[in-house]
């Protein structure tokens, strides 16, 4: 799996614990593997929601699988919660779109998961 | 909706009310309402077209719903207008990929559209 | 076709002709034509794969057609190749995301491929 | 300058109420999460309550210790917030720190008051 | 809830010494700690966060290190002002506990 998170809030803003967290808490909630999850967080983005700059996130995970319906509503509640206690970003400011990714269009250390 | 660009121009070619005319435009063709609208704009990027640096933009629009050919044609006429008229990126360096996004497949205030 | 790399690779170890080289390459491997190709890197960036910030990278590739098991581990062995001997990101740090676009779904030139 | 500055501490008998105000100035309240913290001999420093901001519905947490007793409360027009306390115990006696972290700087407690004394005895 | 266990409860050493006290948590917190130091009389002062980043205007005589369960503040060249209790306290989730502080004094 691999979350991606874009937000407006500076660098100096996030938490020195944060992507490890991410990876635990994500390992957790996918039941994927720790060694298997990438997280990639970009901070200071030139960005807007409801037309207003106050904090706030677009994001995306990407897993083979396990994207559903009611995993996807657990994962909301996950990220936007922790959105909100590392960055204080409201969670009614954050989009994450999930993608459930075939396994042959996963490419990693070169081949594909398929 | 979320509109994303990434380009090569520069910050400082980047106009104040850019974010703002993004959102107000896209909320006109796309018939959502302003609030649900995000717009994230990436200045100064490393990256190619045709294998020239020039002025180039590579671009996303994810929608839940309102997606589709006759649609897309004419957000694509929109936008490259747009990215032609304030940021002086030609439309024949652009790219802009479409999403039509499963409700149940974006989360928002921590859980989903679905 | 478009392909992005995210990385904790710092810019300037990011060589000279690493985008040239790239649109080359995937020229090549798509059998499309190198002006319709455009390269993104993203360097610098806040990343962890496997809960460490050893060098990783986050790719993706979208293309209209072209897309499919055999096709993508082709790109997988190159791209991975190129992104071991150019930015020493090791394989196994490096995950791809193949996208098979829609021709309605890419905007270019004030309108779609469709 | 940033400040914080509480009042209204003294004596108060057990099962008793008081209520407690903290008043910010220096940086953009309706921004910051405000926070109590007490300090006794006997139990040192403690977490006591949490109000964010209004971005984030103003949302209210407590330590276990108060639950049910205390309320955080706060008036961004005023730059102020409140910790009203009730059914006051011996345990509740020490020194109430309003502290807060406000957005744009660090995410920790980086402003504190100089503290007001609370006193339960009969 | 995470506990923070400080040691040692109470030191002391002459000016220009080099100085370690260590905070444990019960539990992971990743780098959610952050180091204060209180004066007689006067409330908590923030010093770092992060576990190891120095707030602003702290002298880099201070140094913090550490993540997970095992933390550490380092005072080096000890100077009449830096004498006084100091505490660790996580951040991880509520309740955001305290050590139990670790008053230095001088020798």
């Known amino acids: 799996p691999m979350f991606i998170v874009n937000t407006n809030v500076p660098r100096a803003s996030v938490p020195e614990g944060f992507l490890s967290e991410l990876t635990q808490q994500l390992a957790q909630a996918t039941g994927k593997p720790a060694q298997y999850i990438a997280v990639h967080v970009v901070p200071d983005q030139l960005m807007t929601f409801s037309g207003t700059n106050d904090p706030c996130a677009l994001c995306s995970l990407h897993s083979i699988g396990k994207i559903g319906g009611a995993q996807n509503r657990n994962y909301s509640k996950l990220l936007c919660g922790l959105l909100s206690d590392r960055l204080h970003i409201s969670p009614d400011r954050v989009y994450i779109n999930y993608y459930d990714m075939n396994a042959a269009n996963v490419g990693w250390n070169g081949s594909t998961f398929a | 909706p979320m509109f994303i660009v990434n380009t090569n121009v520069p910050r400082a070619s980047v106009p104040e009310g850019f974010l703002s005319e993004l959102t107000q435009q896209l909320a006109q063709a796309t018939g959502k309402p302003a609030q649900y609208i995000a717009v994230h704009v990436v200045p100064d990027q490393l990256m190619t077209f045709s294998g020239t640096n020039d002025p180039c933009a590579l671009c996303s629009l994810h929608s839940i719903g309102k997606i589709g050919g006759a649609q897309n044609r004419n957000y694509s006429k929109l936008l490259c207008g747009l990215l032609s008229d304030r940021l002086h990126i030609s439309p024949d360096r652009v790219y802009i990929n479409y999403y039509d996004m499963n409700a149940a497949n974006v989360g928002w205030n921590g859980s989903t559209f679905a | 076709p478009m392909f992005i790399v995210n990385t904790n690779v710092p810019r300037a170890s990011v060589p000279e002709g690493f985008l040239s080289e790239l649109t080359q390459q995937l020229a090549q491997a798509t059998g499309k034509p190198a002006q319709y190709i455009a390269v993104h890197v993203v360097p610098d960036q806040l990343m962890t794969f496997s809960g460490t910030n050893d060098p990783c990278a986050l790719c993706s590739l979208h293309s209209i057609g072209k897309i499919g098991g055999a096709q993508n581990r082709n790109y997988s062995k190159l791209l991975c190749g190129l992104l071991s001997d150019r930015l020493h990101i090791s394989p196994d740090r490096v995950y791809i995301n193949y996208y098979d676009m829609n021709a309605a779904n890419v905007g270019w030139n004030g309108s779609t491929f469709a | 300058e940033v400040k914080l500055e509480e009042s209204g501490g003294g004596l108060v008998q057990p099962g008793g109420s008081m209520k407690l105000s903290c008043a910010a100035s220096?940086?953009?309240?309706?921004?910051?999460?405000m926070y109590w913290v007490r300090q006794s001999p006997e139990k040192g420093l403690e977490w006591v309550a949490e109000i964010r901001s209004k971005a984030h519905n103003h949302a209210t947490y407590y330590a276990e210790s108060v639950k049910g007793r205390f309320t955080i409360s706060r008036d961004d027009s005023k730059s102020s917030v409140y910790l009203q306390m009730s059914s006051l115990r011996a345990e509740d006696t020490g020194i109430y720190y309003c502290?807060?972290?406000?957005?744009?700087?660090?995410?920790?407690?980086?402003?504190w008051g100089a503290g007001t004394t609370v006193t339960v005895s009969s | 809830d995470i506990q923070m266990t400080q040691s040692p409860a109470s030191l002391s050493a002459s000016v220009g010494e080099t100085v370690t006290i260590t905070c444990r948590a019960s539990?992971?917190?990743?780098?959610?700690l952050t180091w204060f130091q209180q004066k007689q009389g006067k409330s908590p002062q923030l010093l770092v966060y992060d576990a190891k980043t120095l707030a602003e205007g702290v002298p880099s005589s201070f140094s913090g290190s550490g993540s997970g369960t095992q933390f550490s503040l380092k005072i080096i060249s000890l100077q009449p002002e830096h004498f006084g209790s100091y505490y660790c306290q996580h951040h991880y989730g509520r309740p955001y506990t305290f050590g139990g502080g670790t008053k230095l004094e001088i020798k």
């Open positions: 502290t807060s972290h406000h957005y744009g700087s660090s995410w920790y407690f980086d402003v």
């Open positions: 220096g940086f953009t309240f309706g921004d910051a999460w």
């Open positions: 539990e992971n917190i990743y780098s959610y």
